[in-house]
Protein backbone atom coordinates (compact mmCIF):
# COMPACT_ATOMS: atom_id res chain seq x y z
CA UNK A 1 0.00 0.00 0.00
CA UNK A 2 1.70 3.01 -1.07
CA UNK A 3 -1.04 5.57 0.53
CA UNK A 4 -3.39 5.66 3.68
CA UNK A 5 -6.02 7.86 4.68
CA UNK A 6 -7.14 8.76 8.28
CA UNK A 7 -10.26 10.76 8.69
CA UNK A 8 -11.15 12.62 12.17
CA UNK A 9 -14.19 11.27 12.33
CA UNK A 10 -15.70 8.23 9.92
CA UNK A 11 -19.45 9.62 10.50
CA UNK A 12 -20.37 12.88 10.84
CA UNK A 13 -23.68 15.18 11.74
CA UNK A 14 -25.12 15.75 8.23
CA UNK A 15 -23.62 19.12 7.60
CA UNK A 16 -20.78 18.94 9.73
CA UNK A 17 -16.86 19.40 8.23
CA UNK A 18 -14.79 16.81 8.09
CA UNK A 19 -10.94 16.09 7.98
CA UNK A 20 -9.13 13.73 5.97
CA UNK A 21 -4.80 13.11 5.84
CA UNK A 22 -3.86 11.52 2.98
CA UNK A 23 -0.23 9.69 3.62
CA UNK A 24 2.29 8.41 0.99
CA UNK A 25 5.09 6.21 2.06
CA UNK A 26 8.71 7.28 0.67
CA UNK A 27 9.63 4.04 -0.79
CA UNK A 28 7.17 4.25 -3.50
CA UNK A 29 9.31 4.17 -6.23
CA UNK A 30 7.57 4.64 -9.31
CA UNK A 31 6.68 7.64 -7.76
CA UNK A 32 7.86 11.26 -8.56
CA UNK A 33 10.32 12.58 -6.03
CA UNK A 34 7.21 15.48 -5.15
CA UNK A 35 3.87 13.86 -5.93
CA UNK A 36 0.77 15.76 -6.30
CA UNK A 37 -1.68 14.18 -3.64
CA UNK A 38 -5.59 14.88 -5.29
CA UNK A 39 -8.58 14.43 -3.43
CA UNK A 40 -11.66 13.42 -4.41
CA UNK A 41 -15.41 13.00 -3.16
CA UNK A 42 -17.24 10.06 -4.85
CA UNK A 43 -16.83 11.26 -8.49
CA UNK A 44 -15.70 14.77 -8.17
CA UNK A 45 -12.23 16.38 -7.00
CA UNK A 46 -11.56 18.74 -4.45
CA UNK A 47 -9.85 21.26 -3.96
CA UNK A 48 -7.76 22.84 -0.98
CA UNK A 49 -5.66 19.86 -0.07
CA UNK A 50 -2.71 21.40 1.82
CA UNK A 51 0.51 18.78 1.47
CA UNK A 52 3.78 18.83 2.77
CA UNK A 53 6.54 16.63 3.09
CA UNK A 54 7.53 14.89 6.84
CA UNK A 55 10.75 14.45 8.77
CA UNK A 56 10.76 10.86 7.43
CA UNK A 57 10.33 11.28 3.80
CA UNK A 58 7.03 10.77 3.69
CA UNK A 59 4.31 13.11 1.79
CA UNK A 60 1.21 13.98 3.66
CA UNK A 61 -1.85 15.83 2.09
CA UNK A 62 -4.60 17.42 4.59
CA UNK A 63 -8.16 18.41 3.67
CA UNK A 64 -10.87 19.89 5.40
CA UNK A 65 -14.39 19.31 3.68
CA UNK A 66 -16.51 22.20 5.76
CA UNK A 67 -19.65 20.92 5.17
CA UNK A 68 -20.51 17.12 4.65
CA UNK A 69 -23.72 17.04 2.64
CA UNK A 70 -23.95 13.68 1.36
CA UNK A 71 -25.34 10.73 3.61
CA UNK A 72 -23.08 8.19 2.45
CA UNK A 73 -19.74 9.10 0.09
CA UNK A 74 -16.27 7.79 -0.59
CA UNK A 75 -13.24 9.95 0.00
CA UNK A 76 -10.03 8.85 -1.88
CA UNK A 77 -6.85 10.19 -2.35
CA UNK A 78 -4.82 9.87 -5.60
CA UNK A 79 -2.09 10.03 -7.60
CA UNK A 80 -1.99 11.02 -11.29
CA UNK A 81 -0.17 8.40 -13.25
CA UNK A 82 0.01 9.07 -16.60
CA UNK A 83 -2.87 9.79 -18.01
CA UNK A 84 -4.86 8.50 -15.40
CA UNK A 85 -5.65 9.02 -11.68
CA UNK A 86 -4.18 6.36 -9.41
CA UNK A 87 -6.44 5.96 -6.08
CA UNK A 88 -4.60 5.41 -3.29
CA UNK A 89 -6.75 4.92 -0.76
CA UNK A 90 -10.45 5.17 0.00
CA UNK A 91 -12.74 5.76 2.93
CA UNK A 92 -16.47 5.82 3.09
CA UNK A 93 -17.67 8.64 4.98
CA UNK A 94 -21.36 8.66 6.84
CA UNK A 95 -23.34 11.40 7.61
CA UNK A 96 -26.83 11.83 9.34
CA UNK A 97 -28.87 12.66 12.77
CA UNK A 98 -28.54 11.00 16.13
CA UNK A 99 -31.77 9.42 16.92
CA UNK A 100 -35.20 11.11 17.79
CA UNK A 101 -36.32 10.18 21.00
CA UNK A 102 -38.71 7.11 19.88
CA UNK A 103 -42.19 8.40 20.54
CA UNK A 104 -46.05 7.02 20.72
CA UNK A 105 -45.01 4.11 22.99
CA UNK A 106 -48.07 1.90 23.04
CA UNK A 107 -48.86 -1.53 23.83
CA UNK A 108 -51.63 -4.40 24.15
CA UNK A 109 -51.81 -7.28 25.38
CA UNK A 110 -52.55 -10.22 23.06
CA UNK A 111 -54.29 -13.25 24.98
CA UNK A 112 -53.75 -15.63 22.08
CA UNK A 113 -50.60 -15.31 21.65
CA UNK A 114 -49.87 -14.91 25.01
CA UNK A 115 -47.38 -11.67 24.73
CA UNK A 116 -47.43 -8.21 24.96
CA UNK A 117 -47.31 -6.37 22.05
CA UNK A 118 -45.92 -3.03 22.05
CA UNK A 119 -45.24 -0.37 18.62
CA UNK A 120 -43.59 3.07 18.78
CA UNK A 121 -42.76 5.78 15.82
CA UNK A 122 -39.22 5.93 15.42
CA UNK A 123 -39.19 9.92 14.48
CA UNK A 124 -37.24 11.43 11.73
CA UNK A 125 -34.79 9.55 9.15
CA UNK A 126 -31.10 9.62 10.77
CA UNK A 127 -29.61 8.45 7.36
CA UNK A 128 -27.39 5.90 9.85
CA UNK A 129 -27.80 1.90 10.57
CA UNK A 130 -29.86 2.48 13.91
CA UNK A 131 -31.39 0.35 16.07
CA UNK A 132 -34.16 -0.11 18.47
CA UNK A 133 -34.69 -2.09 21.96
CA UNK A 134 -37.49 -2.62 23.67
CA UNK A 135 -36.36 -2.18 27.28
CA UNK A 136 -38.06 -3.27 30.23
CA UNK A 137 -38.82 -4.88 33.89
CA UNK A 138 -40.66 -5.79 36.33
CA UNK A 139 -42.09 -3.52 39.24
CA UNK A 140 -44.16 -3.84 42.38
CA UNK A 141 -45.25 -0.52 42.54
CA UNK A 142 -45.65 2.31 40.21
CA UNK A 143 -42.32 1.91 38.29
CA UNK A 144 -40.49 3.96 40.61
CA UNK A 145 -38.46 1.01 41.93
CA UNK A 146 -36.66 -1.01 39.22
CA UNK A 147 -37.18 -5.24 39.81
CA UNK A 148 -36.46 -7.77 37.71
CA UNK A 149 -35.15 -6.53 34.32
CA UNK A 150 -36.29 -8.55 31.09
CA UNK A 151 -34.57 -9.52 28.52
CA UNK A 152 -34.27 -6.97 25.91
CA UNK A 153 -36.55 -7.29 22.83
CA UNK A 154 -35.49 -6.60 19.62
CA UNK A 155 -37.51 -5.85 16.84
CA UNK A 156 -36.77 -7.03 13.17
CA UNK A 157 -34.85 -4.86 11.04
CA UNK A 158 -36.94 -1.84 10.07
CA UNK A 159 -40.01 -2.87 12.16
CA UNK A 160 -41.35 -0.44 15.03
CA UNK A 161 -42.83 -3.07 16.86
CA UNK A 162 -41.47 -5.93 19.59
CA UNK A 163 -43.48 -8.73 21.59
CA UNK A 164 -42.60 -9.95 25.05
CA UNK A 165 -43.73 -13.24 25.61
CA UNK A 166 -45.73 -14.85 28.41
CA UNK A 167 -42.63 -16.02 30.53
CA UNK A 168 -41.44 -12.69 30.57
CA UNK A 169 -44.38 -11.07 31.88
CA UNK A 170 -46.33 -11.43 34.78
CA UNK A 171 -49.85 -10.07 34.82
CA UNK A 172 -51.45 -8.01 37.49
CA UNK A 173 -47.81 -6.42 37.86
CA UNK A 174 -46.92 -3.07 36.59
CA UNK A 175 -43.87 -3.08 34.26
CA UNK A 176 -41.31 -0.04 33.09
CA UNK A 177 -40.94 -0.04 29.36
CA UNK A 178 -39.32 2.16 26.80
CA UNK A 179 -37.59 2.13 23.47
CA UNK A 180 -33.90 3.19 23.66
CA UNK A 181 -32.35 4.19 20.15
CA UNK A 182 -28.65 4.37 19.13
CA UNK A 183 -26.68 4.83 16.32
CA UNK A 184 -22.81 6.03 15.78
CA UNK A 185 -23.95 9.76 16.78
CA UNK A 186 -25.78 9.05 19.81
CA UNK A 187 -28.89 7.46 22.50
CA UNK A 188 -32.17 8.28 22.68
CA UNK A 189 -34.95 7.26 25.08
CA UNK A 190 -38.60 7.36 25.11
CA UNK A 191 -40.30 8.15 28.04
CA UNK A 192 -41.25 5.34 29.79
CA UNK A 193 -44.72 3.56 30.36
CA UNK A 194 -45.46 2.14 33.37
CA UNK A 195 -47.99 -0.59 32.53
CA UNK A 196 -49.64 -3.89 33.99
CA UNK A 197 -50.37 -6.13 31.02
CA UNK A 198 -53.67 -6.98 31.35
CA UNK A 199 -54.78 -3.10 31.39
CA UNK A 200 -53.63 -3.14 28.04
CA UNK A 201 -55.65 -6.41 26.94
CA UNK A 202 -57.28 -6.60 23.71
CA UNK A 203 -60.18 -9.24 23.29
CA UNK A 204 -61.11 -11.04 20.70
CA UNK A 205 -64.81 -10.16 19.08
CA UNK A 206 -68.10 -12.21 20.27
CA UNK A 207 -69.10 -13.55 16.53
CA UNK A 208 -72.30 -12.79 15.52
CA UNK A 209 -75.94 -14.72 15.08
CA UNK A 210 -78.93 -14.63 13.85
CA UNK A 211 -81.48 -15.64 16.35
CA UNK A 212 -82.69 -18.87 16.17
CA UNK A 213 -86.83 -17.95 16.18
CA UNK A 214 -88.22 -20.36 19.05
CA UNK A 215 -91.87 -21.16 18.69
CA UNK A 216 -93.29 -19.09 21.32
CA UNK A 217 -91.26 -15.87 20.79
CA UNK A 218 -93.06 -13.51 18.78
CA UNK A 219 -91.33 -12.88 15.37
CA UNK A 220 -89.11 -9.36 15.00
CA UNK A 221 -91.33 -6.53 13.96
CA UNK A 222 -90.67 -4.71 10.86
CA UNK A 223 -87.65 -2.42 11.16
CA UNK A 224 -86.05 -4.76 13.68
CA UNK A 225 -83.73 -7.36 13.86
CA UNK A 226 -83.17 -9.91 16.46
CA UNK A 227 -79.52 -10.72 17.17
CA UNK A 228 -77.67 -12.98 19.36
CA UNK A 229 -73.92 -13.38 19.91
CA UNK A 230 -70.92 -15.80 21.17
CA UNK A 231 -68.79 -14.71 23.14
CA UNK A 232 -65.32 -15.64 22.72
CA UNK A 233 -64.67 -18.26 25.08
CA UNK A 234 -61.22 -17.62 26.45
CA UNK A 235 -62.28 -13.64 27.33
CA UNK A 236 -65.38 -15.20 28.89
CA UNK A 237 -64.23 -14.64 32.53
CA UNK A 238 -63.41 -11.20 31.65
CA UNK A 239 -66.30 -8.48 32.48
CA UNK A 240 -66.57 -6.60 29.66
CA UNK A 241 -68.94 -3.70 27.38
CA UNK A 242 -70.03 -4.14 23.71
CA UNK A 243 -71.38 -2.19 21.06
CA UNK A 244 -72.91 -2.78 17.83
CA UNK A 245 -72.76 -1.06 14.54
CA UNK A 246 -74.76 -1.36 11.42
CA UNK A 247 -75.96 -0.17 7.99
CA UNK A 248 -77.48 -0.73 4.69
CA UNK A 249 -75.65 -2.92 2.44
CA UNK A 250 -76.73 -0.70 -0.22
CA UNK A 251 -75.88 2.77 -0.58
CA UNK A 252 -73.49 5.42 0.84
CA UNK A 253 -74.90 5.53 4.59
CA UNK A 254 -71.98 5.31 7.10
CA UNK A 255 -71.74 2.84 10.03
CA UNK A 256 -74.44 3.85 12.93
CA UNK A 257 -72.93 3.06 16.56
CA UNK A 258 -75.46 1.42 19.11
CA UNK A 259 -74.02 0.74 22.47
CA UNK A 260 -72.71 0.48 24.91
CA UNK A 261 -75.67 -2.88 24.90
CA UNK A 262 -76.99 -4.26 28.49
CA UNK A 263 -74.26 -5.60 30.23
CA UNK A 264 -73.69 -9.50 29.85
CA UNK A 265 -76.62 -9.48 27.01
CA UNK A 266 -75.95 -12.09 24.90
CA UNK A 267 -78.96 -11.14 22.69
CA UNK A 268 -80.05 -7.96 21.69
CA UNK A 269 -83.24 -7.11 19.46
CA UNK A 270 -81.83 -3.78 17.25
CA UNK A 271 -85.03 -1.86 16.30
CA UNK A 272 -85.55 1.65 13.98
CA UNK A 273 -84.21 0.09 10.98
CA UNK A 274 -85.88 0.39 7.44
CA UNK A 275 -88.28 -2.73 6.97
CA UNK A 276 -87.85 -4.88 4.13
CA UNK A 277 -83.57 -3.44 3.70
CA UNK A 278 -80.47 -6.09 4.21
CA UNK A 279 -78.05 -4.58 6.92
CA UNK A 280 -74.67 -5.30 7.84
CA UNK A 281 -73.75 -5.61 11.35
CA UNK A 282 -70.43 -5.91 14.11
CA UNK A 283 -69.83 -5.92 17.33
CA UNK A 284 -66.81 -5.31 19.22
CA UNK A 285 -66.27 -5.51 23.10
CA UNK A 286 -63.76 -3.95 25.83
CA UNK A 287 -62.77 -5.37 29.24
CA UNK A 288 -65.05 -2.70 31.41
CA UNK A 289 -65.14 -1.12 34.38
CA UNK A 290 -61.15 -2.20 34.20
CA UNK A 291 -58.90 -0.77 31.80
CA UNK A 292 -58.27 -2.22 28.19
CA UNK A 293 -58.44 -2.35 24.62
CA UNK A 294 -61.37 -2.58 22.42
CA UNK A 295 -61.53 -5.94 20.67
CA UNK A 296 -61.36 -5.57 16.34
CA UNK A 297 -64.93 -5.51 15.14
CA UNK A 298 -66.58 -8.99 14.49
CA UNK A 299 -66.55 -10.74 10.84
CA UNK A 300 -69.75 -8.84 9.66
CA UNK A 301 -73.22 -10.53 9.55
CA UNK A 302 -75.56 -9.71 6.83
CA UNK A 303 -79.12 -9.72 7.97
CA UNK A 304 -82.93 -8.36 6.44
CA UNK A 305 -85.85 -6.67 8.16
CA UNK A 306 -89.13 -7.89 7.97
CA UNK A 307 -91.69 -6.07 5.52
CA UNK A 308 -93.89 -3.53 7.05
CA UNK A 309 -97.09 -5.20 7.75
CA UNK A 310 -99.88 -4.09 4.69
CA UNK A 311 -101.89 -1.60 5.17
CA UNK A 312 -105.70 -1.65 4.33
CA UNK A 313 -106.37 1.96 3.56
CA UNK A 314 -106.55 3.29 0.09
CA UNK A 315 -104.54 6.02 -1.84
CA UNK A 316 -106.30 8.40 -3.87
CA UNK A 317 -104.39 9.44 -6.99
CA UNK A 318 -105.84 13.32 -7.34
CA UNK A 319 -104.92 14.55 -11.00
CA UNK B 1 -58.56 -11.15 53.47
CA UNK B 2 -60.99 -12.34 50.84
CA UNK B 3 -63.17 -15.32 52.39
CA UNK B 4 -65.55 -17.40 51.32
CA UNK B 5 -67.90 -19.79 53.51
CA UNK B 6 -70.16 -22.55 52.21
CA UNK B 7 -72.95 -23.59 54.15
CA UNK B 8 -76.47 -26.18 53.61
CA UNK B 9 -74.78 -29.03 52.87
CA UNK B 10 -75.89 -32.54 54.59
CA UNK B 11 -77.57 -35.99 54.05
CA UNK B 12 -80.12 -35.94 51.60
CA UNK B 13 -82.27 -38.91 49.68
CA UNK B 14 -82.19 -39.83 46.05
CA UNK B 15 -84.96 -37.45 44.13
CA UNK B 16 -84.19 -34.81 47.12
CA UNK B 17 -83.17 -31.14 46.75
CA UNK B 18 -80.24 -29.20 48.78
CA UNK B 19 -79.53 -25.26 48.41
CA UNK B 20 -76.20 -24.33 49.18
CA UNK B 21 -74.67 -20.96 49.61
CA UNK B 22 -71.82 -19.36 49.65
CA UNK B 23 -70.89 -16.11 51.94
CA UNK B 24 -67.92 -13.49 50.33
CA UNK B 25 -66.18 -10.96 52.23
CA UNK B 26 -63.19 -9.66 51.20
CA UNK B 27 -63.92 -8.16 47.92
CA UNK B 28 -66.50 -6.63 45.95
CA UNK B 29 -68.53 -9.21 45.01
CA UNK B 30 -70.21 -8.12 42.31
CA UNK B 31 -67.34 -7.26 39.98
CA UNK B 32 -65.92 -11.58 39.36
CA UNK B 33 -67.55 -14.36 38.49
CA UNK B 34 -68.34 -16.88 40.84
CA UNK B 35 -68.56 -20.65 40.57
CA UNK B 36 -68.74 -24.01 41.87
CA UNK B 37 -66.48 -27.51 42.00
CA UNK B 38 -66.87 -30.41 43.64
CA UNK B 39 -65.18 -33.47 44.79
CA UNK B 40 -66.53 -37.08 45.10
CA UNK B 41 -64.67 -38.59 48.28
CA UNK B 42 -61.61 -40.46 47.31
CA UNK B 43 -61.28 -38.18 43.77
CA UNK B 44 -60.39 -35.41 41.39
CA UNK B 45 -62.24 -32.10 41.04
CA UNK B 46 -65.18 -31.57 38.75
CA UNK B 47 -66.03 -27.96 37.50
CA UNK B 48 -69.97 -27.92 38.51
CA UNK B 49 -70.85 -24.42 37.35
CA UNK B 50 -70.14 -20.40 36.90
CA UNK B 51 -71.96 -17.32 37.16
CA UNK B 52 -71.19 -13.89 36.02
CA UNK B 53 -70.65 -10.69 37.97
CA UNK B 54 -74.36 -9.53 37.54
CA UNK B 55 -76.19 -12.99 37.00
CA UNK B 56 -76.52 -12.64 33.07
CA UNK B 57 -74.66 -16.05 32.21
CA UNK B 58 -74.80 -19.42 33.95
CA UNK B 59 -72.93 -22.26 32.12
CA UNK B 60 -72.98 -25.95 33.49
CA UNK B 61 -71.43 -29.26 33.62
CA UNK B 62 -73.49 -31.70 31.76
CA UNK B 63 -73.88 -33.53 34.67
CA UNK B 64 -75.59 -31.10 36.40
CA UNK B 65 -77.67 -29.40 33.46
CA UNK B 66 -81.27 -29.01 34.17
CA UNK B 67 -81.11 -30.26 38.10
CA UNK B 68 -78.67 -27.77 38.98
CA UNK B 69 -79.13 -23.60 39.58
CA UNK B 70 -76.33 -21.38 40.26
CA UNK B 71 -77.29 -18.05 41.46
CA UNK B 72 -76.47 -14.68 43.26
CA UNK B 73 -77.56 -11.93 45.01
CA UNK B 74 -74.98 -9.33 45.04
CA UNK B 75 -76.53 -7.28 47.90
CA UNK B 76 -76.03 -10.19 50.18
CA UNK B 77 -72.90 -10.85 48.59
CA UNK B 78 -73.68 -14.42 48.57
CA UNK B 79 -73.96 -17.15 45.83
CA UNK B 80 -76.06 -20.00 45.80
CA UNK B 81 -76.34 -23.41 44.20
CA UNK B 82 -80.08 -25.25 44.04
CA UNK B 83 -79.31 -28.80 43.68
CA UNK B 84 -82.55 -30.63 42.33
CA UNK B 85 -83.42 -34.26 41.61
CA UNK B 86 -80.15 -35.35 43.39
CA UNK B 87 -78.02 -38.65 42.09
CA UNK B 88 -75.44 -40.63 44.40
CA UNK B 89 -72.88 -39.75 42.02
CA UNK B 90 -73.47 -36.11 43.39
CA UNK B 91 -72.36 -36.88 46.73
CA UNK B 92 -69.20 -34.97 47.04
CA UNK B 93 -67.62 -31.95 48.95
CA UNK B 94 -68.91 -28.38 46.60
CA UNK B 95 -66.65 -25.99 47.22
CA UNK B 96 -67.49 -21.84 45.73
CA UNK B 97 -64.73 -20.33 44.40
CA UNK B 98 -64.21 -17.03 43.23
CA UNK B 99 -63.06 -16.62 39.25
CA UNK B 100 -60.23 -14.58 38.00
CA UNK B 101 -60.07 -12.87 34.52
CA UNK B 102 -58.33 -15.79 32.97
CA UNK B 103 -60.45 -18.73 34.89
CA UNK B 104 -58.85 -19.73 37.48
CA UNK B 105 -60.11 -20.21 41.30
CA UNK B 106 -58.94 -18.51 43.89
CA UNK B 107 -59.66 -18.06 46.64
CA UNK B 108 -61.81 -21.43 47.31
CA UNK B 109 -64.16 -21.93 50.33
CA UNK B 110 -63.54 -24.43 52.92
CA UNK B 111 -66.39 -26.77 51.03
CA UNK B 112 -69.65 -28.46 52.10
CA UNK B 113 -70.03 -32.02 51.99
CA UNK B 114 -73.68 -32.69 50.60
CA UNK B 115 -74.53 -36.52 50.79
CA UNK B 116 -76.91 -38.36 48.69
CA UNK B 117 -78.23 -41.72 49.90
CA UNK B 118 -81.16 -43.22 50.90
CA UNK C 1 -64.98 -30.40 25.61
CA UNK C 2 -61.30 -30.19 26.46
CA UNK C 3 -59.92 -33.35 28.38
CA UNK C 4 -57.13 -32.56 30.78
CA UNK C 5 -54.56 -35.42 31.12
CA UNK C 6 -51.92 -35.16 33.94
CA UNK C 7 -48.97 -37.59 34.37
CA UNK C 8 -47.52 -39.30 36.56
CA UNK C 9 -50.52 -39.95 38.58
CA UNK C 10 -48.11 -40.35 41.58
CA UNK C 11 -44.71 -40.00 42.44
CA UNK C 12 -42.72 -40.55 45.45
CA UNK C 13 -40.15 -38.33 46.03
CA UNK C 14 -37.53 -36.97 48.76
CA UNK C 15 -37.05 -33.88 50.13
CA UNK C 16 -34.41 -31.33 48.45
CA UNK C 17 -35.80 -33.12 44.70
CA UNK C 18 -36.30 -31.67 41.46
CA UNK C 19 -40.01 -32.59 41.10
CA UNK C 20 -41.68 -32.38 37.62
CA UNK C 21 -45.38 -33.12 36.84
CA UNK C 22 -46.68 -32.74 32.99
CA UNK C 23 -50.58 -31.79 31.90
CA UNK C 24 -51.49 -32.60 28.26
CA UNK C 25 -55.15 -30.80 26.96
CA UNK C 26 -56.65 -32.54 24.03
CA UNK C 27 -56.63 -28.98 21.84
CA UNK C 28 -54.82 -26.27 22.27
CA UNK C 29 -55.80 -23.81 25.16
CA UNK C 30 -52.79 -20.98 24.32
CA UNK C 31 -51.77 -20.33 27.82
CA UNK C 32 -55.02 -20.79 29.76
CA UNK C 33 -53.67 -23.48 32.43
CA UNK C 34 -53.45 -23.39 35.79
CA UNK C 35 -52.05 -25.06 38.72
CA UNK C 36 -53.63 -26.02 42.38
CA UNK C 37 -52.28 -27.70 45.52
CA UNK C 38 -54.17 -29.42 47.70
CA UNK C 39 -53.72 -31.01 51.10
CA UNK C 40 -55.66 -33.75 52.40
CA UNK C 41 -59.09 -32.58 54.05
CA UNK C 42 -58.33 -29.04 52.60
CA UNK C 43 -59.72 -27.20 49.83
CA UNK C 44 -57.45 -26.65 46.88
CA UNK C 45 -54.57 -23.62 46.36
CA UNK C 46 -53.93 -22.04 43.78
CA UNK C 47 -50.20 -22.28 42.59
CA UNK C 48 -50.13 -20.89 38.78
CA UNK C 49 -52.07 -18.85 36.66
CA UNK C 50 -52.24 -18.26 32.78
CA UNK C 51 -49.34 -21.25 32.61
CA UNK C 52 -46.51 -19.14 34.11
CA UNK C 53 -47.58 -16.45 36.38
CA UNK C 54 -47.12 -17.33 39.91
CA UNK C 55 -49.35 -16.36 42.30
CA UNK C 56 -49.00 -13.58 45.12
CA UNK C 57 -47.00 -15.80 48.16
CA UNK C 58 -46.48 -18.92 46.49
CA UNK C 59 -42.96 -19.87 46.97
CA UNK C 60 -40.69 -19.12 43.82
CA UNK C 61 -39.67 -23.02 43.72
CA UNK C 62 -42.90 -23.45 41.98
CA UNK C 63 -42.87 -23.08 38.24
CA UNK C 64 -45.05 -23.22 35.20
CA UNK C 65 -44.04 -23.69 31.91
CA UNK C 66 -45.59 -24.47 28.49
CA UNK C 67 -48.37 -23.34 26.10
CA UNK C 68 -50.58 -25.17 23.21
CA UNK C 69 -51.09 -28.48 24.51
CA UNK C 70 -48.46 -28.93 26.97
CA UNK C 71 -47.69 -27.75 30.49
CA UNK C 72 -45.32 -28.61 33.21
CA UNK C 73 -45.34 -27.92 36.67
CA UNK C 74 -42.21 -27.71 38.71
CA UNK C 75 -41.02 -27.91 42.18
CA UNK C 76 -37.19 -26.47 41.94
CA UNK C 77 -36.42 -28.19 45.27
CA UNK C 78 -38.89 -30.46 47.00
CA UNK C 79 -40.29 -29.57 50.67
CA UNK C 80 -41.64 -31.12 53.37
CA UNK C 81 -45.15 -28.76 53.22
CA UNK C 82 -44.98 -29.50 49.39
CA UNK C 83 -46.46 -33.30 49.81
CA UNK C 84 -50.07 -32.91 48.48
CA UNK C 85 -51.64 -33.52 45.66
CA UNK C 86 -51.60 -31.18 42.13
CA UNK C 87 -54.31 -30.62 39.63
CA UNK C 88 -53.93 -28.72 36.60
CA UNK C 89 -56.86 -27.35 35.13
CA UNK C 90 -57.57 -25.39 31.76
CA UNK C 91 -60.22 -21.87 31.36
CA UNK C 92 -59.25 -21.60 27.80
CA UNK C 93 -63.38 -22.75 27.32
CA UNK C 94 -66.34 -24.05 29.50
CA UNK C 95 -66.72 -26.39 30.98
CA UNK C 96 -63.66 -25.94 32.70
CA UNK C 97 -61.49 -29.47 33.34
CA UNK C 98 -59.37 -30.68 35.48
CA UNK C 99 -56.43 -33.07 35.19
CA UNK C 100 -56.79 -36.29 37.19
CA UNK C 101 -54.57 -35.31 39.63
CA UNK C 102 -50.60 -35.94 40.45
CA UNK C 103 -50.06 -37.18 44.42
CA UNK C 104 -46.61 -36.42 45.63
CA UNK C 105 -45.70 -38.71 48.08
CA UNK C 106 -42.61 -38.94 50.29
CA UNK C 107 -40.44 -41.98 49.44
Known amino acids: ECGHISVSAPIVHLGDPITASCIIKQNCSHLDPEPQILWRLGAELQPGGRQQRLSDGTQESIITLPHLNHTQAFLSCALNWGNSLQILDQVELRAGYPPAIPHNLSCLMNLTTSSLICQWEPGPETHLPTSFTLKSFKSRGNCQTQGDSILDCVPKDGQSHCSIPRKHLLLYQNMGIWVQAENALGTSMSPQLCLDPMAVVKLEPPMLRTMDPSPEAAPPQAGCLQLSWEPWQPGLHINQKCELRHKPQRGEASWALVGPLPLEALQYELCGLLPATAYTLQIRCIRWPLPGHWSDWSPSLELRTTERAPTHHHHHHHH | EVQLLESGGGLVQPGGSLRLSCAAS????????MGWVRQAPGKGLEWVSS????????PYADSVKGRFTISRDNSKNTLYLQMNSLRAEDTAVYYC???????????WGQGTLVTVSS | DIQMTQSPSSLSASVGDRVTITCRAS??????LNWYQQKPGKAPKLLIY???NLQNGVPSRFSGSGSGTDFTLTISSLQPEDFATYYC?????????FGGGTKVEIK
Open chain 2, 97 to 107: AKLGELGWFDP
Open chain 2, 26 to 33: GFTFSLYW
Open chain 2, 51 to 58: ISSSGGVT
Open chain 3, 27 to 32: QGISSY
Open chain 3, 50 to 52: YAS
Open chain 3, 89 to 97: QQSYSTPLT
